[in-house]
């Protein structure tokens, strides 16, 4: 659909004479008739295919042609049209004499005809106007011509229809040959599609406008790149939606089990060495001079009774020092100068001369130690007992009263409540400080999991289009991770599709 | 007095070149297409060629196409018809003719003889 | 290319008596056809124009009609001068092509 439009410039009649060549009375009162059709091979008369136009008297003789398309008149004139423009033409272009007011052809008597011009012609939609002149003996009319297309029209003979939105169904301007240019932000072949926030993941992000990024179930983050992991997820994270991986040190389905409890706890004080035992219990190795579960005790360095053959320990700031009874000597006494003559071994030990009789050795009796028998034995001394277990002298032996959750004859053995497989239905079962705990699977409940509740929510299969269905099972529901182009809760609704359009 | 006076006819080998002049006079020229229509001995009437009245288009019969050339120097009345590469079927009487039937325009000339041959 | 087909190629007629020649198209040429005569040594004459007008200056007694692919040349009283080659020439799309003719001939 189109428009020709003919803008005429300038007539000379000089002469003012009919094309008879009678002279008009008083003179030629002049309006122009058009015809345009179809391209003929000769120009020949016959139906005016594509249009005709008339104007008003113009004007007498000669005289020039106001242009007037500014005020809504009729230069230049139009010829519309609602076909492909074919690029060629014939317009056929006749100037008449009215004698009274009534232009109509049937009033008119056929000599009132002062000229005529009939051309066969090329023209290009879009190109500027293109200037003729036709001359005869008695008249000269200089004309012009072009053609344009009409509103929403386009292309090279205006065929393509394209009208500018910004709607539900388009977000688009017409280019000069009719094609779509989106307007900033859209995309597609009719600019339907947003252009996502830059940088929202193309799986597991989606928007509705532009520059926006909204996340599919079990996705997070202003780019849609984060999962979600599984609700009540403690300490670990996920690579796919609703997982809960464990972080170094922790376990259990929630990751809320501290299996390294030395790091986290750091409980072992005054340097002490911390080594993890099992579920949140740890044992300290204490450095000299410490002691206590967490080798929180400072020890005296008297306290490991350094001193022998009866001397005494006196406690100073860098260490300490024996003062030796008489007939020994050396930093810890350890030298005599008594012989089996002088009876230095007590508590019934035995004495053995050494060296030719220049020293001599106890053999002590159980329970007693020490270079001369002197010391009874303290057993728990080395502090044999682990896991923070209390040592007990009990006469001639000694015993080792355990923390909870430890047995053995040095508290060596973790006691594991879980050895009897407690928990039912295939539950998970966690060993604790007091007790146990059982996690138990989709559709169990209760301390050992004996009391069925549901069934997995993702047994029925619930969702469309190949998404991927994950039970949550704080809640015993479903959520389904749409593949990329659907939505809805189950996945159930294609997006970005185009509708169809009207046209 | 109408007169349409074709000129540069004559004798010429295969493969040669000729060029055809058609003078007007008496009326106006450059208001009308312009066209060359052939007559080969014992044969009918037969269009080479069209140039229209400002020389925008130009048409030409599909033997000659590549070959002949139309053209007008609406300045000097005169149409042209340029023809290379001439073949023995080009032999013909070579009329121009100016034909408007909406305006009752039909103007002949009287032919100029192009013969091709070796 | 629309092609044109004349009939009869010889027609023998009296003179003062009525010839009819037809001239048929391969398609519709919308009325955009012309009849010549030609004579020997002479260029064509047109005579009738967009299937029915009559040129001007050229007698009455010549007439044609037609539309769509059939057109007709009428002669109504044939004179001595109008034995000639007679031939129709269709102006609606190039390539332009003509008639065979039709030899008219005093019988």
């Known amino acids: 659909s189109g428009v020709f439009q003919l803008q005429l410039q300038e007539f000379i009649n000089e002469r003012g004479v009919l094309a008879s060549g009678r002279p008009c009375e008083p003179g030629c009162r002049t309006f122009f008739r058009v015809c345009l059709k179809h391209f003929q091979a000769v120009v020949s008369p016959g139906p005016c295919t594509f249009g005709t136009v008339s104007t008003p008297v113009l004007g007498t003789n000669s005289f020039a042609v106001r242009d007037d398309s500014s005020g809504g008149g009729r230069n230049p004139l139009q010829l519309p049209f609602n076909f492909t423009w074919p690029g060629t033409f014939s317009l056929i272009i006749e100037a008449w004499h009215a004698p009274g007011d009534d232009l109509r052809p049937e009033a008119l008597p056929p000599d009132a005809l002062i000229s005529k011009i009939a051309i066969q012609g090329s023209l290009a939609v879009g190109q500027n106007w293109l200037l003729d002149e036709q001359t005869s003996t008695l008249t000269r009319l200089r004309y012009s011509y072009r053609v344009i297309c009409s509103d929403n029209y386009y292309g090279d003979n205006c065929s393509r229809l394209c009208k500018k939105r910004n709607d539900h169904f388009g977000h688009y301007v017409c280019q000069p040959d009719g094609n779509l240019s989106c307007l900033p932000g859209w995309t597609g072949e009719y600019c339907q599609q947003p252009i996502c926030l830059s940088g929202c993941h193309e799986q597991n992000g989606y928007c509705s406008k532009p520059a926006e990024c909204l996340c599919r179930p079990g996705w997070q983050g202003r780019l849609c790149n984060e999962c979600i992991p599984h609700n009540g997820c403690r300490h670990g994270t996920c690579s796919t939606p609703w997982q809960c991986t464990c972080d170094e040190g922790w376990g259990g389905l929630f990751c809320d089990q501290d299996l390294n409890y030395c790091t986290h706890h750091s409980p072992c004080k005054n340097g002490a060495t911390c080594s993890n035992s099992g579920q949140r219990s740890y044992t300290c190795t204490c450095r000299p001079g410490y002691t206590g579960v967490d080798c929180e005790l400072e020890l005296s360095e008297c306290d490991s009774n350094p001193c022998r053959n009866g001397g005494s320990c006196k406690d100073q700031e860098d260490g300490y020092h024996c003062l030796c009874p008489p007939g020994y000597y050396g930093l810890h006494c350890e030298h005599s100068t008594l012989s089996c003559a002088d009876s230095p071994c007590f508590n019934g030990g035995s004495c053995r001369e050494r060296n030719q009789g220049a020293n001599y050795a106890c053999e002590c009796p159980p329970n007693f130690t020490g270079s001369n028998c002197e010391k009874k034995v303290d057993r728990c001394t080395s502090n044999p007992c682990a896991n923070g277990g209390q040592c007990l002298n009990r006469g001639p032996s000694r015993m080792c009263r355990c923390r909870p959750g430890f047995t053995g004859t040095y508290c060596e053995l973790h006691v594991s409540d879980c050895a009897r497989n407690p928990c039912a239905h295939g539950g998970t079962c966690h060993d604790l400080e007091n007790g146990l705990m059982c996690t138990c699977p989709a559709g169990f409940s209760g301390r050992r999991c004996e009391v069925r509740t549901s069934i997995d929510a993702c047994a029925s299969s619930p969702c469309f289009n190949r998404a991927t269905c994950y039970t949550d099972l704080s809640t015993d529901t479903f959520v389904c991770n749409c593949p990329y182009g659907f939505v809805g809760s189950r996945c159930e609704f294609p997006v970005g599709l185009p509708p169809s359009f009207p046209w | 007095e109408v007169q349409l006076v074709e000129s540069g006819g004559g004798l010429v080998q295969p493969g040669g070149s000729l060029r055809l002049s058609c003078a007007a006079s008496?009326?106006?020229?450059?208001?009308?297409?312009m066209y060359w229509i052939r007559q080969a001995p014992g044969k009918g009437l037969e269009w080479v060629a069209f140039i229209s009245h400002g020389g925008g288009i130009t048409y030409y019969r599909d033997s000659v196409k590549g070959r002949f050339t139309i053209s007008r120097d609406n300045s000097k009345s005169t149409l042209y018809l340029q023809m290379n590469s001439l073949r023995a079927e080009d032999t013909a009487v070579y009329h121009c003719a100016a034909l408007n039937w909406e305006l009752g325009i039909d103007y002949w000339g009287q032919g100029t003889m192009v013969t091709v041959s070796s | 290319e629309i092609v044109m087909t004349q009939s009869p190629a010889t027609l023998s007629v009296s003179p003062g008596e009525r010839a009819t020649l037809s001239c048929r198209a391969s398609e519709d040429i919308y009325s955009n056809l012309a009849w010549y005569q030609k004579k020997p040594g002479q260029s064509p004459r047109l005579l009738i124009y967009?299937?029915?007008r009559l040129q001007d200056g050229v007698p009455a007694r010549f007439s044609g009609s037609g539309s769509g692919t059939e057109y007709t040349l009428t002669i109504s009283s044939l004179q001595s001068e109008d034995f000639a080659v007679y031939f129709c020439?269709?102006?609606?799309?190039?390539?332009?092509?003509f008639g065979q003719g039709t030899k008219l001939e005093i019988k």
């Open positions: 008496g009326f106006t020229f450059s208001n009308y297409g």
């Open positions: 967009a299937a029915n």
């Open positions: 020439l269709q102006g609606s799309k190039f390539p332009l092509t």
